[in-house]
């Protein structure tokens, strides 16, 4: 899909299994043509996506794409949940698909569940 619109490359229903206490970077790959858009992260709370105001973010620039990164330093248990990035471009709001973080508590890290066990336990999101 080639165009000069801003495009946000987060896969639909993408998932990550991460460990509380570890650092983690959640990337929002952004393609744009001229001016870099203003990008933000939000966390889903039901059907509402709550903007993450006071979180550390940064940009990483590569040849064909840029990454707007949300930093977790460290990951906390309540970071569990679904996140979305959004870009403001020519007065349009472009929203990514949501991506889900499954956080395993460091206390039980020795019995850390597999990615598939995490995926089968949607209650961890609530």
């Amino acid at each position: 899909k080639e165009s000069c619109d801003v495009q946000l490359y987060i896969k639909r229903q993408s998932e990550h299994s991460i460990l509380a206490g570890d650092p983690f970077e959640l990337e929002c790959p952004v393609k744009y043509c001229a001016n870099r858009p203003h990008v933000t992260w939000c966390k889903l709370n039901g059907t509402t996506c709550v903007k993450l105001e006071d979180r550390q973010t940064s940009w990483k620039e590569e040849k064909n794409i840029s990454f707007f990164i949300l930093h977790f330093e460290p990951v906390l248990p309540n970071d569990n949940g679904s996140y979305r990035c959004s870009a403001n471009f020519q007065s349009n709001l472009i929203e990514s698909h949501s991506t889900t973080l499954y956080v395993t508590d460091v206390k039980s890290a020795s019995e850390r569940p597999s990615k598939d066990e995490m995926a089968s336990r949607p209650w961890l999101l609530y």
Partner: antibody, heavy 119, light 112 residues
Framework: QVQLQESGPGLVKPSGTLSLTCAAS????????MYWVRQPPGKGLEWIGR????????RYNPSFKSRATISADKSKNQASLKLSSVTAADTAVYYC????????????WGQGTLVTVSS | DVVMTQSPLSLPVTLGQPASISCRSS???????????LNWLQQRPGQSPRRLIY???KRDSGVPDRFSGSGSGTDFTLKISRVEAEDLGVYYC?????????FGQGTKLEIK
């Protein structure tokens, strides 16, 4: 264009492990989801599971009761399926397929491999 | 699991005439992003399935415009405006909204 090539043994012994590989061309698999579907002779389609090759995250059909393992090798641009403790009921054509993870803009199936479970 | 129910399971048609296949899901396929992930596949005899329609009504590239998809929520339809010989085979609906992904039983389109 996107193409898939499955490979693996066509005959597996009961209680053994079925192993198939699916090599992709025309696309970088990290931008996709890859999945496996099977079709017993003369019957319909059954979804086995999928992988996000970018991070290895998998989803399975619970009916396979942890017998299925899907993996991906980004450096080889391929995915694999292993199905353990097979019985005659696992005899089927096994298809791998790939689709665009961002926009669903393509969905391509391999040619399928008939795997027979028999001693 | 979401149960996908197709009807009819066998559809005898006359070449040049229209055909219609129904697909019902046991729960809504409307995703949280506002899109409905309902696909239609065609499987010609001896061949692999290929996607014809995605997101209910979008045709894949190379799919003739005699194929159209419609519907919402739990009720979906695939229509062929004028059946041609190359259209014969089995058609499957399947959902990509919820895990595990599930398929309809298939509808066999055959010559009357």
């Amino acid at each position: 264009q996107v193409q898939l090539q499955e490979s693996g043994p066509g005959l597996v012994k009961p209680s053994g492990t079925l192993s198939l590989t699916c090599a992709a061309s025309g696309v970088n698999i990290k931008d996709t989801y890859m999945y496996w579907v099977r079709q017993p002779p003369g019957k319909g389609l059954e979804w086995i599971g999928r992988i996000d090759p970018a991070n290895g995250y998998t989803r399975y059909n619970p009916s396979f009761k942890s017998r299925a393992t899907i993996s991906a090798d980004k450096s080889k641009n391929q995915a694999s399926l292993k199905l353990s403790s097979v019985t005659a009921a696992d005899t089927a054509v096994y298809y791998c397929a790939v689709y665009d993870g961002y926009y669903e803009s393509f969905d391509v199936w391999g040619q399928g491999t008939l795997v027979t479970v028999s001693s | 699991d979401v149960v996908m129910t197709q009807s009819p399971l066998s559809l005898p048609v006359t070449l040049g005439q229209p055909a219609s296949i129904s697909c019902r899901s046991s729960q809504s396929l409307l995703d949280s992003d506002g899109k409905t992930y309902l696909n239609w596949l065609q499987q010609r005899p001896g061949q692999s399935p290929r996607r014809l329609i995605y997101l209910v009504s979008k045709r894949d590239s190379g799919v003739p415009d005699r194929f159209s998809g419609s519907g919402s929520g739990t009720d979906f339809t695939l229509k062929i405006s004028r059946v041609e010989a190359e259209d014969l085979g089995v058609y499957y609906c399947w959902q990509g909204t919820l895990f595990p992904r599930t398929f309809g039983q298939g509808t066999k389109l055959e010559i009357k």
